[in-house]
Structures are given as C-alpha cells and as structure tokens.
C-alpha cells in the first residue's frame, strides 16, 4: 500500500529528529498532499530554512556548538530578503552572533557552512569591520543605520541565531 509505506517513512524520519526536536510544525508544500516541509517548534521558517533565536548569552564558539547540537549552524545570511525576515524576530537592544568569523584576524571572513564570503552581499554597519582582534560577527541595531553587522570579540557572550534546512517528510 503506497500510503502506508509513505506514512512509515515519515514516522521513521520524524524519529530521527525527535531527540532534539520533539515537536515539528509542518506545512503542505504546493498542492501535493504527499509533500510536507517542517520546522522544529517554535522555530520560524523562511523559504527553505528554519531559524531559532537563542536568548542565552554565550561565546561565539559555544553558540555555534549549541546550534550544531540542534542540527543547525549559526545563521548564514545570503540575501537582503533573508536578513529582512530575520530582523523581524530580533530585539533592538540586543546583539546576535552570525555564523561569520575571521579566526586568523586577517580579514578573511568565512561562513560556518563554507558558503563563499561575497563582499557584495554583506550588511556591515558603516566603518565596520574595524578591529583585527574582533573576529566574530554580530547583527545589531543602530539608530542611524537600522540593522547591520559589526565585528566583536568572539569570547564576549551574546545572543545568537541558528539556521537549519527545512525538514521534508
């Protein structure tokens, strides 16, 4: 029975995620009842990704490990539209780690998922990045420029944003 085997496959896939994500919120993709895309509850979704705002204050490395445990990474921002979506869920008086760092202090910025760093798709505040010792990137709000990126010390605890691919079942 086709529907039965599809259900069994879904259940086994859900079991994979159950350890870290006991609850998923799923929506039907398109018109085909067979295809569902899910994000862990209470993550938010945008296009093909899920996002989680971590309000615990942790260093950049610990923040990345924390995302990793949940099957995610610190957020990699690929477009202005994606950033515009993300900032809807952020608090103006807080700063949030991005998945962007320069561990060598040579201004060779790198994304955690190995996405090539494209200078043309960056949203640094004016005058940033400005310190070779500040090797990790945050997104924060400045009244003059709204939301943008800033380089800060990696060991300084901040909030963070995790991102993972949607779960398709």
């Amino acid at each position: 029975n086709f529907m039965y085997s599809k259900t069994v496959k879904r259940l086994s896939k859900l079991r994979e995620y159950q350890q870290y994500h006991p609850s998923l919120t799923c929506v039907m993709e398109g018109k085909d009842i067979e295809d569902w895309s899910c994000c862990p509850t209470p993550w938010t979704s945008f296009q093909s990704s899920c996002y989680f705002i971590s309000t615990g204050m942790q260093s950049w490395t610990k923040s990345q490990k924390n995302c990793s445990v949940m099957g995610a990474d610190l957020v990699v921002i690929n477009t202005r539209e994606e950033q515009d979506f993300i900032i809807q869920n952020l608090k103006r008086n807080s700063s949030y780690f991005l998945g962007l760092s320069d561990p060598g202090g040579r201004r060779h910025w790198q994304w955690v998922d190995q996405t090539p760093y494209n200078e043309n798709v960056t949203f640094w505040h004016s005058g940033e990045p400005n310190n070779l010792d500040e090797r990790c990137a945050i997104i924060n709000f400045r009244s003059s420029e709204e939301w943008g990126w800033n380089d800060i010390h990696c060991h300084v605890p901040q909030k963070s944003i995790c991102k993972m691919k949607k779960i398709y079942i």
Partner: antibody, heavy 121, light 111 residues
C-alpha cells in the same frame, strides 16, 4: 622591548579607594586589549578586568563588578584600574597584562612586575 | 564559568627527570582544531611568564624542554628534562569564553 610598569598600590582601609596605573612602552599600545590580573598572598591568579583595544568593551567578574572600573588613555600609553569600596579580600598583587589574540580567544603574552594593594584597618 | 582543575597541586622531581602537569576543564575549550588553553610559569617574586599558547605552541624564547598537548577538556604541560631553574608555580588558563579562568596552580620543586 615590551614593558609594562604598574604603580599606585598601597595600604588602604576597607571601604577606601585606589587608582592603579600601568605605563606601557615598546609596542603600539592602542592596538592591544589589556587586562588586570591579581594574586592574593600565597594564592593563584585571578582575572580582574579587561578592556578592548578600541575601548569599546570592558568586562569584570562578579567579585569586582560595580566597584572596579578599567579604563585606558591610548594617547598616554596608559591603563588604569579605579578601585572603590575596597574589601580585605581585594588584598593582592595586581598585574597589568597585554592580550594577544589567537583564533577565537587570546592569551597574556606580557606581564608587568605588579603593584601591591593591601586593604586593612 | 569554565573551571580549570590542575593536578597535582605540587610535585618534586629530580633534575633530568620528566615533570607532567595536567589541567582539566569543566567543558571543552577546543573549537575546530584550535585549543584555547595556555600555560604560564611563575617563579617566586616574579610575574607570570607565558610558556605555551593554544595547547602546544612554544612561546618564543622558551626552552624546548617545555611542551604542551591535549584537546577538548584535558591538557598536559611536560618539562623534560627538568632543570634546577624550573622550580616555579605553573598555571593553565582558558580563553575560549569570558571570563578567562586560571587553574589553581602546580608547584614544581627540584629534589
């Protein structure tokens, strides 16, 4: 040659204040984060405060937060520690240390000789 | 805060022998192959002096008889062979996150 020279220590009564200074030479002071680390008599090392190179970031442990203030004057190549509401447990040798960043963290590559603070009635 | 526990608290070693000091962190201080644990030597009446940074890198001017190893939560400082001038206290320090913390120290005496 890198040199860090602390001054300003002394004997002070509980509740009193002191201002420690650290004069830096032999390197571009404004390019480095700096810290104060203390050592109580016969005890180990305890980090007291940090200030970033650009003065944008200061950090303290709970034991001194609200009582101690770290600051710097890059034009004078000087680091300071203003210590208020001093307690007996603040008695220690206070070292000024330069931070050198490595990957996602840092270490203290140069230390001053230290200045002694004694809090006693 | 990350707690660093050094052992032993003290040890006496004969010249020419090996001295081994361990430092255990309450959580990992490593990230993607970088180990943010450092070692300092402090002789009586002197300030601390950097020996090893990032677990295994020998600071310039430090004799090659000092070496460091380890990853994640367990790190080791080895002095081999020990010389009389190595009488000192030795401290580990982590910097992967604030606040930076030090181990309680190990006193090395030469027999």
């Amino acid at each position: 040659e890198v040199q860090l020279v602390e001054s300003g220590g002394g004997l002070v009564k509980p509740g009193g204040s002191l201002r420690l200074s650290c004069a830096a030479s032999g390197f571009t002071f404004s390019s480095y984060g700096m810290s104060w680390v203390r050592q109580a008599p016969g005890k180990g090392l305890e980090w007291v405060s940090t200030i970033s190179s650009g003065d944008s970031y200061t950090y303290y442990p709970d034991s001194v937060k609200g009582r101690f203030t770290i600051s710097r004057d890059n034009a004078k190549n000087s680091l300071y520690l203003q210590m208020n509401s001093l307690r007996a447990e603040d008695t220690a040798v206070y070292y000024c240390a330069r931070q050198l960043y490595y990957s996602y963290g840092y270490y203290f590559d140069y230390w001053g000789q230290g200045t002694t603070v004694t809090v006693s009635s | 805060d990350i707690v660093l526990t050094q052992s032993p608290a003290s040890l006496a070693v004969s010249p020419g022998q090996r001295a081994t000091i361990t430092c255990r962190a309450s959580e990992s201080v490593s990230f993607h192959g970088t180990h943010l644990m450092h070692w300092y030597q402090q002789k009586p009446g002197q300030p601390p002096k950097l020996l090893i940074y990032a677990a295994s890198n020998l600071e310039s001017g430090v004799p090659a008889r000092f070496s460091g190893s380890g990853s994640e939560t367990d790190f080791t400082l080895t002095i081999n062979p020990v010389e009389a001038e190595d009488t000192a206290n030795y401290y580990c320090q982590q910097s992967i996150e604030d606040p930076p913390t030090f181990g309680g120290g190990t006193k090395v005496e030469i027999k």
